[in-house]
Structure formats: structure tokens, C-alpha cells
């Protein structure tokens, strides 16, 4: 799996999970979230050569096609596979609210 | 939806469905498929600016972050959403076989 256990420990230019910290105020301009200040969102990046973690039959076809026709820019792309939620604390007036924001943290990647 | 109805009728640099014909022998080196000779596989390509057909909360976060830090290459990517199968005819010896290959045709796209 193209997850932290593999990607963070290896030199990998191909599609893999990359660490990324997001600060809500600084990076997104979101001032409404009280806690946490930011979080490890991660992201997916890297090349998708033939058979590198292909998600579907179409992505396998596309990566094979791309080896023959690289100028077509018709290659698969490295995107998130498994995502996890993030629990946040915010206020409505003076009332604290705890909420789970779905699909906020990328845990693994795929070529799609 | 970023499908043929929208994408093939509009000039769209952002993420959208693009037409692509794949010839099995010429483009993939697959000689085992008897019919069809090729098919309209299509593919997804284009930029994923903030809120352009974002698939998840993470892709929305990432596209917003990317406007501030484009050099990070941490932007969402344009990938397939809906896929359809393709029916093919091939031979085992002299026996014809009809099979449905799943997820071979891209029908719409998303930013993920």
C-alpha cells in the first residue's frame, strides 16, 4: 500500500503519500476552527508508470498508452485512496461545538 | 457533471473529460482482442482550481492551499469518476469468447 509505512521510509519519486501540515488560519484563512491549530493532512504526488498501483483497468490501459504516447498527456494521476476524518472544536457564540470533518486526512494513494 | 455532454461541447482548460480512441494493437500491443479493433476510452485532464468539482473535503483543502503554495505541487488531480465496461471478443484456440472488461471507458471526471 502507498501509505506512510512505505512512502515515508523510502526514496520514491513515483506516486506515494507525502507529508503535509495544514495550518487553518495561515494556509486556508479559516479562523473559525478553535482546535486544533492545524493538522497533518498529507497529499499524494508522483509519477504513475505502467502497473504502479493502478486503480482500474482504465488506468492500466492509460499508463500503457502513455509509455507509447507520452506527448498525449493522457497518463493516470496520483490521488488519495483512503481518507480519515478530523475532529475539530469550534464555537457558535460562546457555545463550544465538537464536529468530525470527513475525508480530511489522506492515509494512502493510488494511480487513477 | 464533467461528462461528455458538458466537456465535449465547451472549451474547458479545467478538469474535464477528454476524448481518446485506443487502438488495441497499435497503442497497447494487445493482439489477443479480435473485436473491437479499438474503442473510445476517453481520459480526464485539466487543472483543479479551488471548488472545481472537488471530490472530498481534503481535495477542497488542497486546492485552497495550492493557491498559496503552487510550488508544493500539492494540488488535487483530475481523475475518472464514472466508468463503464467494454464488451470484447477474443479466441481461445478456435473457440470465440465474449467477455466484459470492467472499468474501461471513462464517462465523467472529478478533482480528487
Amino acid at each position: 500500500a502507498l501509505d506512510a509505512a512505505y512512502c515515508f521510509r523510502n526514496v520514491q519519486d513515483n506516486c506515494c503519500l507525502r507529508p503535509l501540515y495544514i495550518d487553518f488560519k495561515r494556509d486556508l484563512g479559516w479562523k473559525w476552527i478553535h482546535e486544533p491549530k492545524g493538522y497533518n493532512a498529507n497529499f499524494c504526488a508522483g509519477a504513475c508508470p505502467y502497473l504502479w498501483s493502478s486503480d482500474t483497468q482504465h488506468s492500466r490501459v492509460l499508463s500503457l498508452y502513455n509509455t507509447i504516447n507520452p506527448e498525449a498527456s493522457a497518463s493516470p494521476c496520483c490521488v488519495s485512496q483512503d481518507l480519515e476524518p478530523l475532529t475539530i472544536l469550534y464555537y457558535i457564540g460562546k457555545t463550544p461545538k465538537i464536529e468530525q470533518l470527513s475525508n480530511m486526512i489522506v492515509k494512502s494513494c493510488k494511480c487513477s | 457533471a464533467l461528462d461528455a455532454a458538458y466537456c465535449f461541447r465547451n472549451v474547458q482548460d479545467n478538469c474535464c473529460l477528454r476524448p481518446l480512441y485506443i487502438d488495441f494493437k497499435r497503442d497497447l500491443g494487445w493482439k489477443w482482442i479480435h473485436e473491437p479493433k479499438g474503442y473510445n476510452a476517453n481520459f480526464c485532464a485539466g487543472a483543479c482550481p479551488y471548488l472545481w468539482s472537488s471530490d472530498t473535503q481534503h481535495s477542497r483543502v488542497l486546492s485552497l492551499y495550492n493557491t498559496i503554495n503552487p510550488e508544493a505541487s500539492a494540488s488535487p488531480c483530475c481523475v475518472s469518476q464514472d466508468l463503464e465496461p467494454l464488451t470484447i471478443l477474443y479466441y481461445i484456440g478456435k473457440t470465440p469468447k465474449i467477455e466484459q472488461l470492467s472499468n474501461m471507458i471513462v464517462k465523467s471526471c472529478k478533482c480528487s
Partner: antibody, heavy 119, light 107 residues
Framework: EVTLKESGPVLVKPTETLTLTCTVS????????VHWVRQPPGKALEWMGL???????RYNSALKSRLTISKDTSKSQVVLTMTNMDPVDTATYYC?????????????WGPGTLVTVSS | EIVMTQSPATLSVSPGERATLSCLAS??????LAWYQQKPGQSPRLLIY???SLQDGVPARFSGSESGPEYTLTISSLQSEDFAVYFC?????????FGQGTKVEIK
């Protein structure tokens, strides 16, 4: 163990180009970002620029026209190139790592290399 | 760019005493501040990040706090190994900038 080590010439002449190499171990350049920071003798630190885990770069606008940062992930090396060197560029040059990309503080530093610009 | 102003330039303290170092940001940096310790001939060492988070391996006598645009590094009881130069750094906006440093010397 995480280590970074700078190497390159200790003396360069004015108008020449400086090339410094930062060799890292204990972590991957496809996972972490690497920054360059310099410090003139007895003075404050100055952030110069960084190279992302994905290969993108960002430079201090005051130095942007003279700086190039690149890397060779297979060799675990980051290279700083600075053109048109001047005596005011005499400083100790450090490479450093941020603990998580986009955290923007530096948890591991190289020992630094003193570069003197003089004719 | 964001200007970081440290005070005092030099702080004379006896071992065992408390030291308080200040760093003022020219604009709001939303707690995105780090503190480093540097000894002669050595590279900086990260002590505090996010204004108040203690870096792994750093003694608990070091602490960070903030009040508006002013950020403070406190060393509760100075040890002999703490005499050094301390720099603050904002990690809020490009270009990341450092203060000019505070030298903590033996009184």
C-alpha cells in the same frame, strides 16, 4: 539517525558562482523539505529558500534572482547555487529540514560551512 | 516581510535565576513562532515551535508563551549549558524571518 552536512568551497571570489551541496541521511528527500539558511559572522540568521519533497522551490525574494536550489533524490543531495557573489555574502551557510513539510521551522540542521567572499 | 524584534540584545543572569526573553512581531503571526538556541561555532538547536510547543529532548525549564504580538521564551532556572544566543523565527509567512538574537551571558 537524521543528519545533514554541507560541503563546498570555503573561499570564492567576487562575481563568482557559489555551489554548495547538502548531503542528508536518515530521511528521504521525497518525504521532507530542505531549506538553506545563512548567517553572516556575528549576525542574525537569514532564510534563503527551500526545495519541496515534490521538487518545487521557493526563494527569499531578496535573493531570488541569484539563487537556484535543486536536488538529486537518489544521491540524497540538495544543491544550492548562488551567482554573482559579493563580500556581503560572506556567511556560514546551513541546510536544515522542517519536521513536516509546511511546518516551516527547522528540527535538524547541518553543522554549517563558512564561505568567505574575497579577492 | 515580517520583522522580528528581540529584546534585550544582551541579558546578564546568574546561574539558577530565571531568564525572560522577548520577541515582537511586526504583524500577526498566529502563534507561528519558533525559538532556537545557538552556541559559538554550532548550528542552531530548535527549542520551541508553535509559540509554546516544546521540541522533543528539550528540558522542561524552557517554555514559550505569547501575549498579542509579543512572544516570550522563559528559562525557569538557568544552567551553565544555557548560556548562549537565542533566536526567534516566525514560520507564518514567506520569507521566514529571524530576530537579531538575544545573548544570555553569565552575570
Amino acid at each position: 539517525e537524521v543528519t545533514l552536512k554541507e560541503s563546498g568551497p570555503v573561499l570564492v571570489k567576487p562575481t563568482e558562482t557559489l555551489t554548495l551541496t547538502c548531503t542528508v541521511s536518515g530521511f528521504s528527500l521525497t518525504t521532507y523539505n530542505v531549506h538553506w539558511v545563512r548567517q553572516p559572522p556575528g549576525k542574525a540568521l537569514e532564510w534563503m529558500g527551500l526545495i519541496w519533497n515534490t521538487g518545487g522551490t521557493r526563494y527569499n525574494s531578496a535573493l531570488k534572482s541569484r539563487l537556484t536550489i535543486s536536488k538529486d533524490t537518489s544521491k540524497s543531495q540538495v544543491v544550492l547555487t548562488m551567482t554573482n557573489m559579493d563580500p556581503v555574502d560572506t556567511a556560514t551557510y546551513y541546510c536544515a529540514r522542517d519536521p513536516v513539510p509546511n511546518k516551516w521551522h527547522f528540527d535538524f540542521w547541518g553543522p554549517g560551512t563558512l564561505v568567505t567572499v574575497s579577492s | 516581510e515580517i520583522v522580528m524584534t528581540q529584546s534585550p540584545a544582551t541579558l546578564s543572569v546568574s546561574p539558577g535565576e530565571r531568564a525572560t526573553l522577548s520577541c515582537l512581531a511586526s504583524e500577526d503571526i498566529y502563534s507561528n513562532l519558533a525559538w532556537y538556541q545557538q552556541k559559538p561555532g554550532q548550528s542552531p538547536r530548535l527549542l520551541i515551535y508553535d509559540a509554546r510547543s516544546l521540541q522533543d529532548g528539550v528540558p522542561a525549564r524552557f517554555s514559550g508563551s505569547e501575549s498579542g504580538p509579543e512572544y516570550t521564551l522563559t528559562i525557569s532556572s538557568l544552567q551553565s549549558e544555557d548560556f548562549a544566543v537565542y533566536f526567534c523565527q516566525q514560520h507564518h509567512a514567506y520569507p521566514f524571518t529571524f530576530g537579531q538574537g538575544t545573548k544570555v551571558e553569565i552575570k
